[in-house]
C-alpha cells in the first residue's frame, strides 16, 4: 500500500513539475528590465527564450520572436536545449510511468517489469528536473554576471555616439517557475526510484533437499519453498508431495552429501 502511494505521489509530483517546466519554457518573463534613463519612464521590457516584449503604461504591448538561430547568444541556445531536453525526457518518463503504476493493470505484466519501468521513469524525471534547474540557473547566472547593472559606457559608433543603456536586469517569473518545477520533477523522480525498491520481488529461494526414504517415495521438489512474494513456479508456497507414481528417472536425484544420512 505504501509503495503504491509513493509511486502514485511521485507520478503526480512529476506531472506537476513537467507541466511547470513546459510553462517556464514558454513564458516570456525570463528577464525583466527597467529602462530608467528614458524620459518616457513607463516602459518595461521583458524577454523569454523565444521572444522579446515591450510593455507600456498605456497598455501597449508588443512582442517579437527571435527569428534567427545562428546569431543568438550561445548561452541562450544552451538554455533552450536544456529546457527542451528536460521536457522530452519528462514526457517520456510520464509515458513510461503510466504503464508502471501499480494501480493500473495492463495484461499480465509482472511486478518485476513494473519495477524496472518505475526505476526508468524515476531516473528520467531526475534527469529532466536537473536539466530544468541547470537551464534556469545558467540563464540566471548570465543575467547576474553580464547584465545586472549595465553602466553607461560611451563610445563612438559609425553613425555617431553609442552608449549602453543603464538597465536594471531582474529575474523574471519564469526563472522561479523553472526552479520550482525542476525541483518538483526531481523529487517526483526520487519518489519513483524509492517506490521501485518496494515493487521489486525478493528472489530468495530456500533450496529444498531431496531425501530418499526407504518406504514410499516422497520428493521435495526444488523451489518448493519460496519467499512469500508469490513469484516462481510454485505460487501457492506449499510443499509438493508426489506419490510413488513416477518414472525411474524422475525419482532418481543427483547425489549430494544429504543422500546418505
Amino acid at each position: 500500500m505504501a509503495v503504491t502511494a509513493c509511486q502514485g505521489l511521485g507520478f503526480v509530483v512529476s506531472l506537476i513539475g513537467i507541466a511547470g517546466i513546459i510553462a517556464a519554457t514558454c513564458m516570456d518573463q525570463w528577464s525583466t528590465q527597467d529602462l530608467y534613463n528614458n524620459p518616457v519612464t513607463a516602459v518595461f521590457n521583458y524577454q523569454g527564450l523565444w521572444r522579446s516584449c515591450v510593455r507600456e503604461s498605456s497598455g501597449f504591448t508588443e512582442c517579437r520572436g527571435y527569428f534567427t538561430l545562428l546569431g543568438l547568444p550561445a548561452m541562450l541556445q544552451a538554455v533552450r536545449a536544456l529546457m527542451i531536453v528536460g521536457i522530452v525526457l519528462g514526457a517520456i518518463g510520464l509515458l513510461v510511468s503510466i504503464f508502471a503504476l501499480k494501480c493500473i493493470r495492463i495484461g499480465s505484466m509482472e511486478d518485476s517489469a513494473k519495477a524496472n519501468m518505475t526505476l526508468t521513469s524515476g531516473i528520467m524525471f531526475i534527469v529532466s528536473g536537473l536539466c530544468a534547474i541547470a537551464g534556469v540557473s545558467v540563464f540566471a547566472n548570465m543575467l547576474v554576471t553580464n547584465f545586472w547593472m549595465s553602466t553607461a559606457n560611451m563610445y563612438t559608433g559609425m553613425g555617431g555616439m553609442v552608449q549602453t543603456v543603464q538597465t536594471r536586469y531582474t529575474f523574471g517569473a519564469a526563472l522561479f517557475v523553472g526552479w520550482v518545477a525542476g525541483g518538483l520533477t526531481l523529487i517526483g523522480g526520487v519518489m519513483m526510484c524509492i517506490a521501485c525498491r518496494g515493487l521489486a520481488p525478493e528472489e530468495t529461494n530456500y533450496k529444498a533437499v531431496s531425501y530418499h526414504a526407504s518406504g514410499h517415495s516422497v520428493a521435495y521438489k526444488p523451489g518448493g519453498f519460496k519467499a512469500s512474494t508469490g513469484f516462481g513456479s510454485n505460487t501457492k508456497n506449499k510443499k509438493i508431495y508426489d506419490g510413488g507414481a513416477r518414472t525411474e528417472d524422475e525419482v532418481q536425484s543427483y547425489p549430494s552429501k544429504h543422500d546418505y544420512v
Partner: nanobody
Framework: QVQLVESGGGLVQPGGSLRLSCAAS????????MGWYRQAPGKQRELVAV???????NYADSVKGRFTISRDNAKNTVYLQMNSLKPEDTAVYYC????????????????WGQGTLVTVSS
C-alpha cells in the same frame, strides 16, 4: 553595425516649418524609444521630444504645441514636425534610439545620430 541618419535640417525663417526624419539601419532587433535632442552653441544637449513603440510621447515644455513627433516602427524611422519655429530653436538636432541588436536581444543600447543643423533666422 547600426547607423542613425538624420535629414531635413536647414535654414528657415521664424514662423516657418521643417520636418526632420531619422532612419535607423543595421542589425536591429527592436527599437524601443526613439527621440530628438538638440544642442545649441555653448549649451548642454537637451530633450526635444521622445516617442515609444506604442506612440506614447513626451515633449520639452519649450516646444509643446509647436513640435510633433511621430514614428514608423516598420521602417525604424522617427519624424519631427516643427512648426512656428523661433530663433531660439536654432541648434544641432540629434536623433536618439534605444534599441537591441539581433545578435544579443538581451542588451539595450542608446544610439545617437551625427546630427542635423537647424537654423532659424530672418
Amino acid at each position: 553595425q547600426v547607423q542613425l541618419v538624420e535629414s531635413g535640417g536647414g535654414l528657415v525663417q521664424p514662423g516657418g516649418s521643417l520636418r526632420l526624419s531619422c532612419a535607423a539601419s543595421g542589425s536591429i532587433f527592436m527599437i524601443n524609444v526613439m527621440g530628438w535632442y538638440r544642442q545649441a552653441p555653448g549649451k548642454q544637449r537637451e530633450l526635444v521630444a521622445v516617442i515609444t513603440r506604442g506612440a506614447s510621447t513626451n515633449y520639452a515644455d519649450s516646444v509643446k504645441g509647436r513640435f510633433t513627433i511621430s514614428r514608423d516602427n516598420a521602417k525604424n524611422t522617427v519624424y519631427l514636425q516643427m512648426n512656428s519655429l523661433k530663433p531660439e530653436d536654432t541648434a544641432v538636432y540629434y536623433c536618439n534610439a534605444d534599441l537591441n541588436l539581433a545578435s544579443d536581444p538581451f542588451k539595450w543600447y542608446t544610439y545617437w545620430g551625427q546630427g542635423t543643423l537647424v537654423t532659424v533666422s530672418s
